[in-house]
Interface confidence: medium
Amino acid sequence: APRGTQAEESPFVGNPGNITGARGLTGTLRCQLQVQGEPPEVHWLRDGQILELADSTQTQVPLGEDEQDDWIVVSQLRITSLQLSDTGQYQCLVFLGHQTFVSQPGYVGLEGLPYFLEEPEDRTVAANTPFNLSCQAQGPPEPVDLLWLQDAVPLATAPGHGPQRSLHVPGLNKTSSFSCEAHNAKGVTTSRTATITVLPQQPRNLHLVSRQPTELEVAWTPGLSGIYPLTHCTLQAVLSDDGMGIQAGEPDPPEEPLTSQASVPPHQLRLGSLHPHTPYHIRVACTSSQGPSSWTHWLPVETPEGVPLGPPENISATRNGSQAFVHWQEPRAPLQGTLLGYRLAYQGQDTPEVLMDIGLRQEVTLELQGDGSVSNLTVCVAAYTAAGDGPWSLPVPLEAWRPVKEPSTPAFSWP
């Protein structure tokens, strides 16, 4: 009877063999069948599931002249770069008429040196600060035991006797390398070597020491930096945005910060060229040969008000009998704060000085003592803020007021 036509008779004349090897191996599984009539398509199964995207080739050879003669069909499944996912039971499957035929199984196994699923990564850590490293490997064959190494020195007496997947490091004081070895029955695989760079700890206790209208002196406590001395610290100051910009934990300033470097020790720095009566935020980071620490939080600080840096401008003083009219303009020089008002002083020869607080007005009418016969009267004006008086103007002599007489207009008189 022709092959493949009876239920009990399998068409397969060659079944898949077995493959066992290490990762990356390339191998081929082969099955052969003899059928009468048109050759069927050969499907491959792994663990009972059809492989839709199998890398297989099918060769068909007729054994006679007639289409109804027997055919030899050979199907080859190529496994390139063997992986754990390729392992399992492989079979060939054909549909002949209303029947399904499956070959005897062949087995693909993986056995070799351990394979790393996870290896330790390079990272930076602050000195004396705990951290964890991860390493994970698998066979087969299992079990796989790990051995951690720090600066090429094993951290346990034998594989499997120390920490396995996660290594907890309580802290480092110098930059170190870590790797792990994976051991199984086939041998040893070594992971990549991770470099753990030890940076200085974040500085602490950043605070203000003293403040002037255009400068702030700040201090901080350096963090530990391991065996690497601090080379310098960097301080950044940025104008505050009325509380809308930087908050305590916000990582980056809203604008380009003013950056200053401080030699250390001392862990103190005078920040100059600031605006008076202005809120700033400051932060500090310290650097060793290994790199910089993380920044501290932004600390809000404020320069105090200063006194005005110049006297009022364009002072004019004119006198008419027992009255004098003085007026001036706001100082051109920086006020260094909020202008609260003006003080005015006037004095005649052999008479005591009279000091007046004018408030925010920029003119005043003075009632002079007597009949105005006091000679050599001079007047000075100063602007003031909450911080105090600015410089006084140079004395301005009170000039007698000389109206231009015209017949049609009466002479001007003070009210």
Epitope: N205, H207, L208, V209, S210, R211, E217, G243, Q247, A248, G249, L299, P300, V301
Partner: antibody
Framework: QVQLVQSGPGLVKPSQSLSLTCSVT?????????WNWIRQFPGQKLEWMGY???????NYDPSLKNRISITRDTSKNQFFLKLNSVTSEDTATYYC????????????WGQGTTVTVSS | DIVMTQSPSSVSVTLGQSASISCRSS???????????LYWYLQKPGQSPQLLIY???NLASGVPDRFSGSGSGTDFTLKISRVEAEDVGVYYC?????????FGGGTKLEIK
């Protein structure tokens, strides 16, 4: 290293003035910080009394304002507490301390002086 | 003035166990700049107070990380994760948001 060392009498008569000195080493009191006085009553309660700033300005607890004065001698790097018209209620341990400008955190303290007001 | 209230007034702890001390302020110590102006002091027997924590959660220089501070604007907690013999003393909270500076009544920590 900053150090604050206190001195002054341990016994003061009622209605008299209590005067204490705080001598600072390791930092100039006119270069920065607030220089505070705090007292601790026998029942452990702490009370801030006031400060003298590096720039010479003062701030006092309002409840003491009429009786307290904090002054300084920059040439000796010392600052002083004077509390007038004392009563037995002023019996306490008095501390001087350095405070930050933002916001008054006191990081270095003197050793404390126990003052008893009694006739 | 801002009133600071501490509880309990005393606490007894076994060595190696954790301890918590609470502090409450009569109004919020959260400044518009995002910082909370609360600090903790420890006064060991026969010594001056020493700064432990400032701005609610920042550890002062030289203070072991067994100490931690947390809280909201008005309710605060000091936690000691593993109490050691040297932690014995009176713990004070205080506010430095504004003058006059004010302190809590203190919590005495003892070892069982």
């Amino acid at each position: 290293q900053v150090q604050l060392v206190q001195s002054g009498p341990g016994l003061v008569k009622p209605s008299q003035s209590l005067s204490l000195t705080c001598s600072v080493t390791g930092f100039s009191i006119s270069s920065g910080y607030y220089w505070n006085w705090i007292r601790q009553f026998p029942g452990q309660k702490l009370e801030w009394m006031g400060y003298r700033s590096y720039d010479g300005s003062n701030n006092y607890d309002p409840s003491l304002k009429n009786r307290i004065s904090i002054t300084r001698d920059t040439s000796k790097n010392q600052f002083f507490l004077k509390l007038n018209s004392v009563t037995s209620e002023d019996t306490a341990t008095y501390y001087c301390a350095r405070g930050w400008l933002l916001h008054y955190t006191m990081d270095y303290w003197g050793q404390g002086t126990t003052v008893t007001v009694s006739s | 003035d801002i009133v600071m209230t501490q509880s309990p007034s005393s606490v007894s702890v076994t060595l190696g166990q954790s301890a918590s001390i609470s502090c409450r302020s009569s109004r919020s110590l959260l400044h518009s700049n995002g910082f909370t102006y609360l600090y903790w002091y420890l006064q060991k027997p026969g010594q001056s107070p020493q700064l432990l924590i400032y701005q609610m959660s920042n550890l002062a220089s030289g203070v072991p990380d067994r100490f931690s501070g947390s809280g909201s604007g008005t309710d605060f907690t000091l936690k000691i994760s593993r109490v050691e013999a040297e932690d014995v003393g009176v713990y004070y909270c205080g506010q430095n948001l504004e003058l006059p500076l004010t302190f809590g009544g203190g919590t005495k920590l003892e070892i069982k």
